[in-house]
């Protein structure tokens, strides 16, 4: 995990200023309003996780 201004986060992850670390873009499915999800725009949006079938 990299600080901003140094090497970028690994593929499939994006820097979170809120959490001060790289975060997985996959988690934007459940938490789409996370600050780092703006950096995950290359990944198509997925529907929010169902709570119950």
């Amino acid at each position: 995990e990299q600080a901003p201004g140094t090497a970028p986060c690994s593929r499939g992850s994006s820097w979170s200023a809120d959490l001060d670390k790289c975060m997985d873009c996959a988690s934007c499915r459940a938490r789409p309003h996370s600050d780092f999800c703006q950096g995950c725009a290359a990944a198509p949006p997925a529907p929010f996780r169902l709570l119950w079938p």
Epitope: G12, L19, S27, R29, A30, A43, R49, W52
Partner: antibody, heavy 119, light 111 residues
């Protein structure tokens, strides 16, 4: 360093109540959902309950086995999460772990606290 | 609820060889982009520890001899080469929807 300390377990009779506590440190507690997961030889690992954030109005979700009997809560000022368990049954006997998750992964686990329901 | 079926229930692998563990989900836990499957390791007498997230991404600090693959309903955990310290029970877990569920576990013994 992330630390999670569960407490409050012990021996309780069927029909009794117990409140488990978990104190967390080493990560931004207010930004993580918190879970209780239990483990028994009979049922293996079993998710019990989850509580989300203040911005989610502290939304809670429960496994079917816990609905109506268990209540999860959190105190962000103390970086703590709780599990109030009522009307306990023999099948609730397990080690109970608290675990934070940002979204999908249970990133860290405490040492667990043992609950035994027996007469 | 999504049922996760792990196989085998236990296996013994010689030091330095490959261990392969399967996890099959009763329905797909993948989008076109990501798979919502995790793997955990639980050493004897210890708490579970996250190994792999989103089917194939190693958690920080996890040795590269661990790898995960799969999508849809079929997932695999590979350990190669196995070491003594890998003696543990391994569990899969999905986060596709609530309730989260775990597989029944696979106990790995090193010969």
């Amino acid at each position: 360093e992330v630390k999670l300390g569960e407490s409050g377990g012990g021996l309780v009779q069927p029909g009794g109540s117990m409140k488990l506590s978990c104190v967390a440190s080493g990560f931004p507690f207010t930004k993580y959902w918190m879970n209780w997961v239990r483990q028994s030889p009979e049922k293996g690992l079993e998710w019990v309950a989850e509580i989300r954030l203040k911005s989610d109005n502290y939304a809670t979700h429960y496994a079917e086995s816990a609905k109506g009997r268990f209540t999860i809560s959190r105190d962000d000022s103390r970086s703590s999460v709780y599990l109030q368990m009522n009307n306990l049954r023999a099948e609730d006997t397990a080690i109970y772990y608290c675990s934070p998750t940002y979204a999908d992964t249970m990133d860290y686990w405490g040492q667990g606290t043992s609950v035994t329901v027996s007469s | 609820d999504i049922v996760l079926t792990q196989s085998p229930a236990s296996l013994a692998v010689s030091l330095g060889q490959r261990a392969t563990i399967s996890c099959k989900a009763s329905q797909s836990v993948s989008t076109s982009t990501y798979s919502y499957m995790q793997w955990y390791q639980q050493r004897p007498g210890q708490s579970p520890k996250l190994l792999i997230k989103y089917a194939s991404k190693l958690d920080s600090g996890v040795p590269a001899r661990f790898s995960g693959s799969g999508s849809g309903t079929d997932f695999t955990l590979n350990i190669h080469p196995v070491e003594e310290e890998d003696t543990a029970t391994y569990y899969c877990q999905h986060s596709w929807e609530l309730p989260y569920t775990f597989g029944g576990g696979t106990r790995l013994e090193i010969k």
